[in-house]
């Protein structure tokens, strides 16, 4: 990635690191406005299976692994990087390395859910606090879960799917901060690990993953005040390990793996019309990407 | 019944390549992490690579990373061994195996083998 | 690399003997070591994983057992069919390492 400044924008679509052939360090963001893709400053480590967030402003690249020809390495890392300078910054890490991590954002602290560190498959879940620069451990989830979905919804933490190291699951559990305590809530139709999972119009959506046979298009939302789950229209790709989030009331997901190749192609939800379109490439086909959108 | 059968084997020089083929039945090479394990002559195993069905990640011994390349067609329901600049210690029975979750990633399954011979 | 050191490399044995086999790991493993069976000319038979469970379809004369980073694989009463070579396995870190075999021979 380039090191100059990067051009003061409003709202992009970051992607950083992934995987194809080995882990990544690229930063890319897209902007929707102009179907443009900028190249930025690569992460100081490659890594995949991480994730992204944003906080005040800043993107963070949570957990992932190095997985390259010297090694395969699990992070504990947290790394933010500036927008405004282009440059990333190590922050506290995490008080063990989470590959396929996921991540939420509740009143402006970081919780990272679950992830592996070699065959250990993690259940823990801590909370990063940006103005201490500290993590501090919360309670643990019900469940183990690697290739975990996380998305934020009315300040609960939603976990949704994942692996437990023996089975994909179904099986979705809810955080409540003020009482920190778990309890599972209704289980997806599909088994889904690895799915993309964010939220819109006060419904967590699920895209994609992998049911323990083969990749995944289907996609289904949750409505919490119902608290059931409903299959809306699928993706063109089935994809596992993508990226995804939400910009301006529509869904983006990006890359994945179908089973046979690491995808390019980025997908848009439009919840309106209940579909899909393709709306990019990424410069590379790449799964196990950490994406985020940057604050207005 | 479960079945693995190698295939690709065969006498190559120094420096030359060979792609070995796994062809699966019985199974979803796609519900399965495929490896691929050799052995020398009258020497013990040796793990050399795999591919994670779910991300597409491979993994492989530092022995043998950034010549052999693991692939998988889940269509073909056949997993691939690419093996460039092949060297004589390279030389060994290649077994492929499945690893499920099942069994929490023992290979439970593998064929018989295939010969690969590096020498001039 | 996480080594795991097996031990005897041999040993020979009548029909009806009970075998101990040890591996010892260089470093943690937790329970993810398996052990397996070959015999001349074939592919590796798995018999045990996760440390004590018992695959499917292996005889109950076959057991596992872990006692902190130290592993020991168990043939109760040895069968004609049990001489072969012995491999134990982690996969609990990469890249996943193998013992150095013991071969069970015919006293």
């Known amino acids: 990635g380039s090191m100059g400044h990067a051009p003061k924008v409003g709202r992009l679509i970051y992607t950083a690191g992934g995987y194809f052939r080995q882990s990544l360090s690229y930063l890319e963001a897209y902007n929707p406005s102009d179907g443009t893709w900028l190249d930025l400053a690569d992460l100081q480590v490659p890594r995949s299976g991480l994730a992204g967030c944003v906080v005040g402003g800043l993107l963070y690249a949570v957990g992932g692994r190095n997985n390259s020809p010297d090694g395969n390495t699990d992070s504990s890392a947290l790394d933010c990087y500036n927008p405004m300078t282009n440059q990333w910054s190590p922050c506290a890490p995490m008080s063990v390395p989470r590959n396929r991590i996921g991540v939420g954002v509740i009143d402006g602290h970081i919780y990272a859910v679950g992830g592996s560190h070699g065959c250990i498959h993690h259940n823990s879940v801590e909370r990063y606090e940006p103005e201490r620069d500290e993590w501090h451990l919360v309670a643990p989830m019900l469940t183990r879960r690697i290739g975990v979905g996380v998305a934020v919804l009315n300040r609960l933490l939603y976990a949704v799917g994942g692996f437990d190291g023996t089975n994909r699951l179904n099986s979705a559990e809810c955080y409540y901060p003020e009482r920190n305590e778990w309890r599972m809530i209704t289980a997806m139709n599909t088994i889904r690990s690895g799915a993309g999972v964010c939220v819109l119009h006060n419904c967590i959506y699920a895209a994609g993953g992998y049911d323990g046979q083969d990749q995944l298009n289907s996609v289904e939302r949750y409505d919490v005040e119902t608290e059931t789950w409903t299959f809306v229209a699928p993706m063109k790709h089935r994809r596992s390990a993508l990226g995804i989030t939400v910009h301006q009331g529509r869904i983006y997901v990006l890359g994945g793996y179908d089973g046979h190749t690491f995808l390019d192609s980025v997908e848009c939800y439009d919840p309106d019309t209940d579909t899909w379109s393709e709306v990019t490439r990424m410069t590379s086909g790449r799964s196990g990407v950490g994406v985020a959108v940057t604050m207005e | 019944e479960v079945q693995l059968v190698e295939s690709g084997g065969g006498l190559v020089q120094p420096g030359g390549s060979l792609r070995l083929s796994c062809a699966a039945s019985g199974f979803a090479i796609s519900a399965s992490s495929i490896h691929w394990v050799r052995q020398a002559p009258g020497k013990g195993l040796e793990w050399v690579a795999s591919i994670d069905p779910e991300t597409g990640e491979t993994l492989y011994a530092k022995s043998v990373a950034g010549r052999f390349t693991i692939s998988a067609d889940t269509s073909k329901n056949t997993a691939y061994l690419q093996m460039n600049s092949l060297r004589a210690e390279d030389t060994a029975v290649y077994y492929c195996?499945?690893?499920?979750?099942?069994?929490?990633?023992?290979?439970?399954?593998a064929g018989q083998g295939t010969l690969v011979t590096v020498s001039s | 690399d996480i080594q795991m050191t097996q031990s005897p490399s041999s040993l020979s044995a009548s029909v009806g003997d009970r075998v101990t086999i040890t591996c010892r790991a260089s470093?943690?493993?937790?329970?993810?070591v398996a052990w397996y069976q070959q015999k001349p000319g074939k592919a590796p038979k798995l018999l045990i994983y996760s440390a004590s469970s018992l695959y499917s379809g292996v005889p109950s004369r076959f057991s596992g057992s872990r006692s902190g980073t130290d592993f020991t694989l168990t043939i109760s009463s040895l069968q004609p069919e049990d001489f072969a070579t012995y491999y134990c396995?982690?996969?609990?870190?990469?890249?996943?390492?193998f013992g150095q075999g013991t071969k069970v021979e015919i006293k």
């Open positions: 195996a499945r690893c499920r979750a099942a069994s929490a990633y023992a290979a439970d399954a």
């Open positions: 396995q982690q996969s609990y870190s990469f890249p996943s390492t």
């Open positions: 470093q943690s493993v937790s329970s993810a």
